[in-house]
Every structure is written in C-alpha cells, then in structure tokens.
C-alpha cells in the first residue's frame, strides 16, 4: 500500500544512475521555449532631448528553444551525498512560434552609454568617455536587430575604448556556448527529504552580492523540489537569472494532462519593499534609486553584473510600485499574463509545468559631462525585454507518469 | 593630497606566493583604475596590470596573467596583487600607481615594494 | 607587443644646456579613437616614476614648462630646455594605445 509507494518513490526520485529522476534530470525530456517580447521606443528624441515619458511598444513573441542539452561534468560524491554538474547554455530560434525574424531592428536604450555613465562616474573619466561616445555616433538611443540585442553585437563606442574591455555587448552576451555553476547538489541517498536542494553554487554557499540571509543559496533550482510536497510549505529555489534565492506559495489545484498538481506562484510579497515585508530589507542595496528602500517590484542586480545597472522586474512591472512605472507609457502589467508560476506533482516533487516570467531593465541617469545624457531631468528605468520560459510535460510522458505514478495511488 | 602606501619588502622562497598591498588615501578609490609595475634590478618598467575597485574589473598583460593576480577592498581602500610560483626572475621592485582618469597615464606611484625570491 | 626604442641610452649634459630625448615605437601609436597615448615620466635615483607629459604634448600639473614633447605616429620626443640639477635621472617614454602597455628602455641623464 502507502508504504510500498513511499518506498519506490523514494528509491525513483534519487539522483544517481538508474533512476527515474536521474534520466530526467540529466537531460529534460520536456520541451523549453523562452519567448521574448522586446520594448520598442517610441519617441527617442523626445526622451534625450526633453527627458518626456519614454514610450514603448512590445514587440513578440521571438521564441527560442533553451535548456536542451544534457548537464555536463555530472560527478557524484559519495562523501557527502552530492551530485556536482554544469548546466550548458543554448538556444535556437523557432521561427514558426515567432512574430518575425532574429533580423528584426528595434530602437532601444544604448546599453553600452547607459552602463558606462554608472559604471564610471569620475567625472574625469566621463569628459573622456564623452569624447568617444561623440567620436563613435552614439546617442542615448540605439536600433539594433534581436540577433545583435539579445546575443551580442561589437559596439562602436567601446572599440574607442583605450583599455583592454569587452567591446561585445548584449543582454544575455555570452550565452551559447557557455553554462551556468558548477552546481553541487543533494542527491537524496542519505536523506530523501535534501533531494535536489542545491549545497554550494560556484563553489560556495553564498552569493557574494547581498547582505545577510538574502545572500544564501536555498533550496532546489525549481526544477525539482523533495517529494511529498505539502500545500502549506513554502518552496525555496534559487534562480541564477535574477541572482538570488526566492520562494513560491501555493496558490491551487490543477489538473495537468490527467495529473492533479499543486500550482505554486511567486507572492507579491516576495517583491515588497522592506516598508511592507522587513524580510527584503536586505534586497535593498540602494537608497536613491530605491527612494530610501520604499519603492518595490524592482530587484538592483547590478552587483552580480559586474556593475552594470540591471533591474530585474516581472513584466510590465507588475507588482512595482507606481514611481518605477511613472516615466514609462504602454506598460500594462497583467498577473495572468505576467507572473511566475510552477505546477508541481506533490508525490514525487517534479516540476511538471512552468511559467517563469521575468523583465530586464537597465538604469539611466542624468550626466552633466556626457552630452547624449545631459538633458536628462530624471533617472529611467528603461525596460528592454521581457521572457516567459515555458515547459509542459509532453503527452507521452504524462501518460507514463499517470500509469506509473498518480495511478498506482488512485 | 593622494597617496599610495605600499607594504613591505618581501624575501620568499621558490615556488611561494607573496600578496603585496597597495593602501590608497586622498581621494576616492572606487572612482580610478589601479595599474602596477614591474621594474626588474637596474631595468626598464613593465606593466602588469589594472583593476577597477568599482566593480573589480581587471585588465592584464598577457605576459603576467597567470601569474598575478588583482584584487581590491574596497572598505579599507587598498588594492592587492598576488604573485605565485614564484622564481628568481620575479625578484624585482613593484609598483602600484594611480589611473589619471582614462587617458591611460598613471599620475600617482606608490613608492614601489621589493620583492626578493631566494632559497 | 609595441617595441619602444629609446635614444640615447645614456645622455650627459651640462646645467643650462638643452637636452633631447628621442622614442620610436615599432608601430603607429595612433589608437582607433584618434588619440596619441604617447606619456613620458621621470624617475629619479631610489624613487618612483613621475609623470612628465601624456599624449605626446601635455604637461602634467607642476610640471616646469621647460619640457616638452612632440611628435606623431611612431617619432617622438622629448625636450628640456635648459636643465637642472633636479631634472637629473632615468627618462621613460611610455605607449597606452595598443594592449600590453610598453615602456621604452630609459634614457639616462647625467651630468657631463
């Protein structure tokens, strides 16, 4: 009965070769897809010359296949029950899930000027770097295609740069060909209860990039959490995109391809400032931009972007406060469309659909030393793209998980 | 006035490493590159390397990359180079110096750390 | 890596006279941004260097306005009007246009 079910599960879920989950886990059998939609300005002259309202459009989806490949360097270590890996980065364009192609222009914020102004704000420096981006034609503004946006492209005013820097520049430059850890992670034999709970990543159990408890690494990577699963827990993951540990709550039950899971949703709490949940306080590295740590639904993540001023938001900055927003128009945030959420089979813990919507943006300010940002009044902070990563178990699968799982249960 | 304190002269053996600092005072740290210099005994200058104590960002001389490396802490505003597998042929006075501010010219010089590798 | 060459390698002068220091470089120092990163620096027995001059002409603050430098593309040099006893050391010419930054081997100055 019970037993027995609890038995197997906990002998299937273990990360080591043999297994149900391992097979699994080693290379998903389900299909990824992260759609773009990028923010088309409207009216550039009009924001860099009279610091108006920057409009924008959304443009998509682009779609992209991700997180085909197998996991890499797979090392188990018997010592302290971890499974150590490398998760390789692709993505390949789906034309046929796309409004168009990677050759499509949009006018965006010109990211290589946004992140040198903050990067560098010895005003010394910034009378240099105004020469050069004077020199190279830049302006606050750029038209670039998806392909050059999204995955690199040379730009014009870092190839004027006298020091050894990067001139490549794109918002997930470099990412084919690269991969995310090593990971080192609990592979369920001693205890069944750790499974897939990551130890250390990078080496360590700390980011390095906040304070305090916001700095550690908990839980899974979401794509799995310890079986048995309860409505009332709260299910911790760490998220390597947003360079930090979050947690999702039950939200309701849903029947997935005959399956019953649990939906867990990230809470807007988990976006609050810490004037309405203390618990972020230490998400709060800022106190201008932040207005004195009182706005919220924007995560400054430019410590673990080697200082450039990313701003991680949900789409639409959803669940934002009202002075994030107020310098942009065409912004309609939507929580169906809008929000992250995981389905999750409660008995084995797997995650069999997801929905991780998250938008990037970038900081400008207002620099007196360099011209394209002189006329500035305010700081912006620009959206350029939104994502939402897909995954649905396939139809094969599920009816294998019926017949071998939830069936034998019911 | 800006000032740049560096540490001691060092005697270490083959195949050590050795981490000398470079304490910057008089103006704001994060805000300029620091670079340093090799000058082996009665010889010509060579430059190693840069990092930018905002966000850490380094730039090397292929010559010296694997074998120094540069840090900063930023809260006592002192940067770090880091030599290891040391041999006599790295046996010389090092430099830190200042950044004049992205005109690739070092405007500040720390008064040079002597570095003796000896069995 | 740009070679720096210096002239003279030694350079004996008497106070008062002027004095001429010469620096090629194995290629045009002209970087893509149209710069000239072509800097001199002094540097004085049993201490560190000092900046002179930075892209090619500029003297640095406090610098006597007995020295100059000019020139272009891969010839340049270095001039002191009349020198003095406190001008006396090793002369550095220093290229920050192409990566790995180079020095010039030095040119001494002494008194005659």
């Known amino acids: 009965g019970d037993m027995l079910i609890q038995k197997t599960i906990k002998k299937e879920v273990v990360l080591e070769e043999g297994t149900i989950a391992f097979k699994n886990w080693v290379k998903t059998g389900t299909e990824i897809y992260r759609q773009f939609w990028i923010f088309d300005v409207q009216n550039p002259q009009e924001v860099m010359m009279n610091s108006s309202n920057i409009q924008v459009k959304q443009r998509g989806p682009y779609t992209y296949r991700v997180r085909f490949l197998a996991k890499e360097n797979i090392t188990q270590d018997p010592k302290d029950n971890t499974v150590s890996f490398l998760q390789p980065n692709g993505a390949i364009f789906e034309p046929s899930l796309s409004v168009g192609t990677e050759a499509d222009n949009f006018t965006v914020l010109n990211l290589a000027v946004a992140a040198a102004s903050h990067i560098y704000p010895n005003p010394f420096v910034q009378v240099v770097l105004n020469s050069l981006i004077n020199k190279s034609k830049s302006s606050m503004f750029q038209v670039r295609t998806l392909r050059e946006l999204l995955w690199g492209y040379t730009d014009p005013f870092l190839s004027l740069v006298p020091y050894p820097v990067s001139t490549r520049v794109g918002m997930f430059y470099p990412y084919n060909n690269t991969a995310d850890g090593v990971y080192k992670v609990f592979n369920g034999k001693d205890s069944i209860s750790k499974v897939a709970i990551i130890d250390t990543y990078k080496g360590k159990r700390n980011l390095s990039y906040w304070e305090s408890y916001c700095d550690m690494i908990n839980g899974t990577d979401a794509a799995s959490f310890p079986p048995f699963v309860e409505k009332s827990q709260v299910l911790q993951f760490f998220s390597s995109d947003i360079c930090r540990s979050i947690y999702a709550v039950f939200e309701s039950d849903v029947n997935l391809k005959g399956i019953p899971v649990y939906r867990f949703v990230l809470p807007s709490k988990a976006f609050a400032s810490p004037v309405q949940n203390p618990d972020n306080h230490c998400f709060c590295t800022e106190k201008i931009i932040s207005k004195n740590c009182t706005s919220y639904g924007v995560l400054d993540i430019s410590k673990c972007k080697e200082g450039k001023p990313v701003y991680i938001s949900l789409p639409h900055f959803l669940y934002a406060s009202p002075d994030v927003s107020e310098t942009i128009d065409g912004l309609n945030p939507n929580e169906e469309e809008h929000r992250t959420y995981l389905d999750i089979e409660p008995i084995t813990g797997f995650t069999l659909q997801f929905a991780k919507r998250l938008q990037v943006n970038l900081l400008v300010k207002p620099s007196n030393k360099i011209q394209v940002l002189k006329r500035l009044k305010r700081n912006y902070i620009v959206p350029i793209l939104w994502l939402n990563e897909t995954g649905t178990i396939g139809d094969e699968k599920a009816k294998m998980f019926r017949s071998q799982v939830t069936g034998k249960i019911n | 006035d800006v000032q740049l304190q560096e540490s001691g002269p060092e005697l270490v053996k083959p195949g050590a490493s050795v981490k000398i600092s470079c304490k910057a005072s008089?103006?704001?740290?994060?805000?300029?590159?620091m670079h340093w210099v090799k000058q082996s005994h009665g010889k010509s200058l060579e430059w190693i390397g840069y990092?930018?104590?905002?966000?850490?960002?380094?730039g090397y001389n292929q010559k010296f990359k694997s074998k120094a490396t540069l840090t900063v802490d930023n809260s006592s505003s002192t940067a770090y180079m880091e030599l290891r597998s040391l041999t006599s042929e790295d046996s010389a006075v090092y430099y830190c110096?200042?950044?004049?501010?992205?005109?690739?010219?070092?405007?500040?010089w720390g008064q040079g750390t002597t570095l003796t590798v000896s069995s | 890596d740009v070679v720096m060459t210096q002239t003279p390698l030694s350079l004996p002068v008497s106070l008062g006279d002027q004095a001429s220091i010469s620096c090629r470089s194995s290629?045009?120092?002209?970087?893509?941004?149209?710069?000239?990163?072509l800097h001199w620096y002094l540097q004085k027995p049993g201490q560190s260097p000092k900046l002179l001059i930075y892209?090619?002409?500029n003297r640095f603050s406090g610098v006597p306005d007995r020295f100059s430098g000019s020139g272009s593309g891969t010839d340049f040099t270095l001039k002191i009007s009349r020198v003095e006893a406190e001008d006396l050391g090793v002369y550095y010419c220093?290229?920050?246009?192409?990566?790995?930054?180079?020095f010039g081997g030095g040119t001494k100055l002494e008194i005659k």
């Open positions: 290629q045009s120092l002209v970087h893509s941004n149209g710069n000239t990163y």
């Open positions: 892209k090619v002409s």
């Open positions: 110096a200042r950044d004049g501010g992205y005109d690739v010219y070092f405007d500040y």
């Open positions: 008089g103006y704001t740290f994060t805000d300029y590159n």
């Open positions: 990092i930018y104590p905002y966000n850490g960002g380094t």
């Open positions: 220093f290229q920050g246009s192409h990566v790995p930054w180079t």
